[in-house]
Interface confidence: medium
């Protein structure tokens, strides 16, 4: 089980990294979307995981952004993030769609609504139950 | 411009309190964990803990959980780090820094001397 | 706690020339490892976050590497304010933890 972890996590970091970078190949970053979505979770140790990835970074005073799978939809009251960004990304996550659009990477707003757990410890639970 | 305010150097004597503040501002304080520092004279650099400033969820380094309270208060964009009752190996410079997973903006530094 | 092994100590090397200062973790870390450097009397300064992406503003002459166990930090054509303290640390699990440091004197 401790080598699955290890094994696990490895495959998290390389598509932490890689996110968004090969428009062709989508299905590790949608398969980890996924698991953000169900497990209300952002990242692997922190949501802060998504700001070593280039495209995904803002400089000192702007915004960072994270996919839109690290929102916490409960959290947001923001009508026009909901129903023009987010929501559209996570019907698509509902249903394992297979299409990639710009609106996957959600800015974080002033109020930080996304998951503020990272990933690691809900996915270590659900393998020693499994 | 993203800047970490400290609060000026203080001289104590063993057993008092004390409270050192970092007001962050130029970006969303409740975007980013605020972290504590310590290096005591002519030492590294010591990790003591963070806060989650939107939550109020703090982690402490082990070494130092007991022996501080990190705190802080959103409405004003300030960080807090207190002890209740201070010792002579407490004397040493503490940094605030930001953090995006490393820490990415630090602030100049508060010296806190303890001394009978 | 993850324990940080940097070396060297301390170094000392011309203006112009190339140096190199490791950095090793006890346990897997991945890319979460960062590089600071202090100068005298001043507060730490992010060079290098997620083992080898610069941070914003710095010479392109600073460059990280490595991931798991092994890292290092490159200073190529060495400057002279490029005089003071080097520090790794890792933000993998709690505690972050930082290396002992380097001292790196510009001759």
């Known amino acids: 089980r401790a080598q699955l972890e290890r094994s696990l996590r490895d495959v998290v970091e390389k598509t932490i990294q890689k996110y968004g970078t090969n428009p062709e190949e989508t299905a590790a970053e949608e398969s980890w979307d996924y698991v953000q979505f169900q497990l209300r979770c952002c990242g692997w140790h922190y949501p802060q995981d998504w700001f070593q990835v280039l495209i995904l970074r803002g400089n000192g005073s702007e915004a960072h952004r994270v996919p839109c799978s690290c929102y916490n939809l409960s959290a947001t009251n923001d009508s026009t993030i909901l129903d023009k960004v987010i929501l559209p990304q996570l019907s698509r996550l509902g249903h394992l769609a297979r299409s990639r659009h710009s609106a996957d990477i959600c800015a974080v707003p002033a109020e930080s609504h996304i998951y503020r757990e990272g990933c690691a410890q809900g996915l270590q639970k659900w393998l020693h139950n499994n | 411009e993203v800047q970490l305010v400290q609060s000026g150097a203080e001289v104590k004597k063993p057993g008092e309190s004390l409270r050192i503040s970092c007001k962050g501002s130029g970006y969303s304080f409740t975007g980013y964990n605020m972290n504590w520092v310590r290096q005591m004279p002519g030492k590294g650099l010591e990790w003591m803990g963070n806060i989650d400033p939107y939550y109020g969820g703090t982690t402490y380094n082990r070494k130092f959980k007991g022996q501080v309270t990190i705190s802080a208060d959103k409405s004003i964009s300030t960080a807090y780090l207190q002890w209740s009752s201070l010792k002579a190996s407490d004397t040493a410079m503490y940094y605030c820094?930001?953090?995006?997973?490393?820490?990415?903006?630090w602030g100049r530094g508060t010296l806190v001397t303890v001394s009978s | 706690d993850i324990q940080m092994t940097q070396s060297p100590a301390s170094l000392s090397a011309s203006v112009g020339e190339t140096v190199t200062i490791t950095c090793r973790t006890s346990e897997n870390v991945y890319s979460y490892l960062a590089w600071y450097q202090q100068k005298q009397g001043k507060s730490p300064q992010l060079l290098v976050s997620f083992a080898k992406t610069l941070a914003e503003g710095v010479p392109s002459r600073f460059s990280g590497s490595g991931s798991g166990t092994q890292f290092s930090l490159k200073i190529s054509s060495l400057q002279p304010e490029d005089s003071g303290s080097y520090f790794c640390q890792h933000h993998s699990d709690n505690p972050w933890t930082f290396g002992g440091g380097t001292e790196l004197e510009i001759k």
């Open positions: 820094a930001r953090s995006v997973g490393p820490m990415d903006y």
